[in-house]
Interface confidence: low
């Protein structure tokens, strides 16, 4: 006869491991007992259990409550056992020794491999700001046994670097994703992908990129200076900028206080019917947590009568 077993039994942490040991004997042969032991190299054999054809299963104290026979029906030639709730420390070499009558003793070894699925964590790097050089966007760490694979899935251009730390029974892999921050990256997903033989499918953790920036400010409304004349209604200046976080706006006048009747409404400065006292230098101040910008314009309110007089003078002077 001969023993049938597996070279390697692989199980995920917390699952039950079936350690197979089946005696394929000739007609009339019987199995008297099956002894299971752990036989890691450099260490003495540690008994797990003894399976006796007459007296049943005896489990050694170190494995009390963790070793069982498979559920019935059972073949009397089957010396397989179940190791309940496998933990990392269970990984190693196991031996079954089968005593048969009349053929004598047989033994076989198998290796138990306990997969420890990783629970990845993603840690964002420091705040990303436009204008920075190559900056850490995020790091992703996963620890498992065997070592997991950590990669990145993103449309964003960047560079990755990985390092691995070996522990006694597992390995931790950390991958970092570096990029040069730009405003176009805002809202883009950066996904850490962890692969491992103990996972039915890859684990993915997504981080949404936020890049602080503030665009240059400009003022609209003065494109046609001729519209800024005494008596005009509805004149307004609008400050243009964009940023992340969204910016706030403030209006001031360089050469004095804002004239009475001028309304500040966020990015817009609204004027009452224009008079010459509205002439001046106006400053739009744009700011967010990242930066601040200024843009200034000169308003020159025209007096149509003065202008026509000036024009005559200019003509006569020529």
């Amino acid at each position: 006869g001969e023993l049938e077993t597996s070279d390697v039994v692989t199980v995920v942490l917390g699952q039950d491991a079936k350690l197979p040991c089946f005696y394929r004997g000739d007609s009339g042969e019987q199995v008297g007992q099956v002894a299971w032991a752990r036989v890691d190299a450099g260490e003495g054999a540690q008994e797990l259990a003894l399976l006796h054809s007459k007296y049943g299963l005896h489990v050694s104290p170190a494995y009390e409550g963790r070793v069982e026979q498979p559920p019935p029906p059972r073949n009397p030639l089957d010396g397989s056992v179940l190791l309940r709730n496998a933990v990392q420390a269970d990984e190693g070499e196991y031996e079954c020794r089968v005593s048969t009558f009349p053929a004598g003793s047989f033994q076989a070894r198998l290796r138990l491999r306990v997969l420890v699925p990783p629970l990845p964590s993603l840690n964002p790097g420091p705040a990303l700001e436009e204008g920075q050089g190559l900056t850490l966007a995020a790091s992703c760490t996963a620890e498992g046994s065997p070592a997991p694979s950590v990669t990145w899935d993103t449309e964003v251009k960047g560079t990755t670097s990985s390092r691995s730390f070996k522990h006694s029974r597992s390995a931790a892999v950390t991958s970092e994703f570096h990029l040069v921050p730009s405003r176009s990256m805002n809202g883009q997903p950066l996904t850490c992908v962890v692969s491992h033989p103990g996972l039915l499918q890859d684990q993915r953790i997504t981080h949404i990129l936020h890049v602080s920036f503030l665009a240059e400010a400009s003022v609209r409304g003065l494109e046609d200076q001729n519209l800024w004349h005494i008596g005009r209604e509805g004149a307004m200046l609008k400050c243009l900028s964009e940023g992340q976080p969204p910016p706030s706006y403030n209006w001031t006048r360089l050469d004095g206080p804002l004239p009475s009747g001028v309304r500040v409404d966020g990015d817009t400065l609204g004027f009452p019917p224009l008079t010459t006292e509205h002439s001046g230098i106006y400053v739009c101040h744009v700011s967010n947590e990242f930066s601040s910008r200024d843009s200034q314009v000169t308003v020159d309110v025209l007096d149509p009568q003065e202008d026509s007089g000036k024009q005559v003078d200019l003509v006569s002077a020529s």
Partner: antibody
Framework: QVQLQESGPGLVKPSETLSLTCTVS????????WNWIRQPPGKGLEWIGY???????NYNPSLKSRVTISVDTSKNQFSLKLNSVTAADTAVYYC?????????????WGQGTMVTVSS | DVVMTQSPLSLPVTLGQPASMSCRSS???????????LNWFQQRPGQSPRRLIY???NRDSGVPDRFSGSGSGTDFTLKISRVEAEDVGVYYC?????????FGGGTKVEIK
């Protein structure tokens, strides 16, 4: 958003097996830890066990010999089987989600299903 | 198993007044990762439980700021700054630091 819905028979005979299913909608079961918790009438909460979506299970030692939790990712469901039930197993059974670690406990719950063990 | 003991069993309160309840664990709930996995759940009559507080003091989204959690080690407290009618129900603490996860017996909040 993610919602959980328990289903299964409301009456089970003593010594038989209690079988319940929790359907996950509004999100994938392929992440997180998925738990069963029960509450006997007028009493407190008892955690039964969890299933990590890859199939790993862990059970409360007080029930371990009788409980099995399994997953069907294609149907976005996970199930509870509790065998050899007695009247003491009469309870409202809840399914609940935990976060990326099992102890990020129970941020989403089903509405519960009452199971009575009686002949 | 870690035993979670809640007190008082019953807490009669007046609307608009503060309320406080205690949860004690038989072992420290400080975990090796630096977190303390102590959670508070609210169960209104006829409803399923709802998590209010996780990791001692972090409020879940949608939980009114009148609820606050505090404590460390083995002693923890849930406070309601001004009780409202909708706060009636049973409050459970639960530890996730030690295996297996265990709940307290609950504190029943009722209006006087």
């Amino acid at each position: 958003q993610v919602q959980l819905q328990e289903s299964g028979p409301g009456l089970v005979k003593p010594s038989e097996t209690l079988s319940l299913t929790c359907t996950v909608s509004g999100g994938s079961i392929s992440s997180y830890f998925w738990n069963w918790i029960r509450q006997p009438p007028g009493k407190g909460l008892e955690w039964i066990g969890y299933l990590y979506y890859i199939g790993t299970t862990n059970y409360n030692p007080s029930l371990k010999s009788r409980v099995t939790i399994s997953v069907d990712t294609s149907k976005n469901q996970f199930s509870l089987k509790l065998n050899s039930v007695t009247a003491a197993d009469t309870a409202v059974y809840y399914c609940a989600r935990s976060g990326n670690y099992y102890n990020d406990a129970f941020d989403i719950w089903g509405q519960g299903t009452m199971v009575t063990v009686s002949s | 198993d870690v035993v979670m003991t809640q007190s008082p069993l019953s807490l009669p309160v007046t609307l608009g007044q503060p309320a406080s309840m205690s949860c004690r664990s038989s072992q420290s709930l400080a975990y090796s990762d630096g977190n303390t996995y102590l959670n508070w759940f609210q169960q209104r009559p006829g409803q399923s439980p709802r998590r209010l507080i996780y990791k001692v003091s972090n409020r879940d989204s949608g939980v009114p700021d009148r609820f606050s959690g505090s404590g460390s080690g083995t002693d923890f407290t849930l406070k309601i700054s001004r009780v409202e009618a909708e706060d009636v129900g049973v409050y459970y603490c639960m530890q996730g630091t030690h295996w297996p996860l265990t709940f307290g017996g609950g504190t029943k909040v009722e209006i006087k």
